[in-house]
């Protein structure tokens, strides 16, 4: 992999997903992403964020919930829920604007 650009202070986060290279990762912030794909049980992934902080501000839907935090291992014990019902104005993958 190419050397990645420095982004200033990094935080250590819990990493739990199929793509984690170890139990922790380092990033600009920590993340928890809860995703429910069609016909499957929701899956919760923990990791690091470096790009597109705007996703942290997205409203939970019945398909996805993003959570972000900024301190050491702050994503370790966070548990997320999905919205129970989808309102007419919301769609899967709701735009984060």
């Amino acid at each position: 992999d190419p050397v990645k650009p420095s982004r200033g202070p990094l935080v250590t986060c819990t990493c739990e997903s199929p793509h984690c290279r170890g139990p922790t990762c380092q990033g600009a912030w920590c993340t928890v992403v809860l995703v429910r794909e069609e016909g499957r049980h929701p899956q919760e992934h923990r990791g690091c964020g470096n790009l597109h902080r705007e996703l942290c501000r997205g409203r939970p839907t019945e398909f996805v919930n993003h959570y972000c935090c900024d301190s050491h291992l702050c994503n370790r014990n966070v548990s997320l829920v999905l919205e129970a019902t989808q309102t007419p104005s919301e769609q899967p993958g709701t735009d984060s604007q």
Partner: antibody, heavy 118, light 108 residues
Framework: QVQLQESGPGLVKPSQTLSLTCTVS??????????WNWIRQHPGKGLEWIGY???????YYNPSLKSRVTISVDTSKNQFSLKLSSVTAADTAVYYC??????????WGQGTLVTVSS | EIVLTQSPGTLSLSPGERATLSCRAS???????LAWYQQKPGQAPRLLIY???SRATGIPDRFSGSGSGTDSTLTISRLEPEDFAVYYC?????????FGQGTRLEIK
């Protein structure tokens, strides 16, 4: 080595919906490290960012196109797709897909020309 | 949205010369998320520089990037015939992502 390949109709009629798919090979679209983008380039002009999707299905669109754009992901097929509704001749362009991480947009698909004409 | 303005619009130089391309942002851009791309006719853009100054894999060391805040520069120290193309700067990492309008580097 990750490769991206755009596919879809090269000709779309005005007022219809443009639909393109980007197939990712050599890597997983489900990795949390990447964002999957669509970009277009009008003939002889510069690059215009359309929007991105994350593996979770969360999206962000260019405000100038937001009302007409939908980007979706199919992790089981390792694909993501673009739909642009109510097209006009001004939507004639080469459409590219690209992977984004903290090292920029790399790789890109080779691009596909979509012409809007009756 | 951050507007990126590239200058000059066209740059006419000879092989062996040094090229300096500028990209100015309408507001401060994190240097971690500033990239440069090269595009040749009929081809997709190719990543040259990311993080304002890091060369992408396989990019010759005659290409270098510098700058911070609102001003970024792409320098090609000694032009080769294959370097004549259009160059775009881009800010990414936060949305909406934007590109500069491009600088055309042509043979004098």
């Amino acid at each position: 080595q990750v490769q991206l390949q755009e596919s879809g109709p090269g000709l779309v009629k005005p007022s219809q919906t443009l639909s393109l798919t980007c197939t990712v090979s050599g890597g997983s679209i489900s990795s949390g490290d990447y964002y999957w983008n669509w970009i277009r380039q009008h003939p002889g002009k510069g690059l215009e960012w359309i929007g991105y999707i994350y593996y979770s299905g969360s999206t962000y669109y260019n405000p100038s196109l937001k009302s007409r754009v939908t980007i979706s992901v199919d992790t089981s097929k390792n694909q993501f797709s673009l739909k642009l509704s109510s097209v006009t001749a001004a939507d004639t362009a080469v459409y590219y897909c690209a992977r984004e991480d903290i090292a920029g947009f790399d790789p890109w698909g080779q691009g596909t020309l979509v012409t809007v004409s009756s | 949205e951050i507007v990126l303005t590239q200058s000059p619009g066209t740059l006419s130089l000879s092989p062996g010369e040094r090229a300096t391309l500028s990209c100015r942002a309408s507001q401060s851009v994190s240097s971690s998320y500033l990239a440069w791309y090269q595009q040749k006719p009929g081809q997709a853009p190719r990543l040259l520089i990311y993080g304002a100054s890091s060369r992408a894999t396989g990019i010759p060391d005659r290409f270098s990037g510098s700058g911070s805040g609102t001003d970024s520069t792409l320098t090609i120290s000694r032009l080769e015939p294959e370097d004549f193309a259009v160059y775009y700067c881009q800010q990414y990492g936060s949305s909406p992502i934007t590109f500069g309008q491009g600088t055309r580097l042509e043979i004098k």
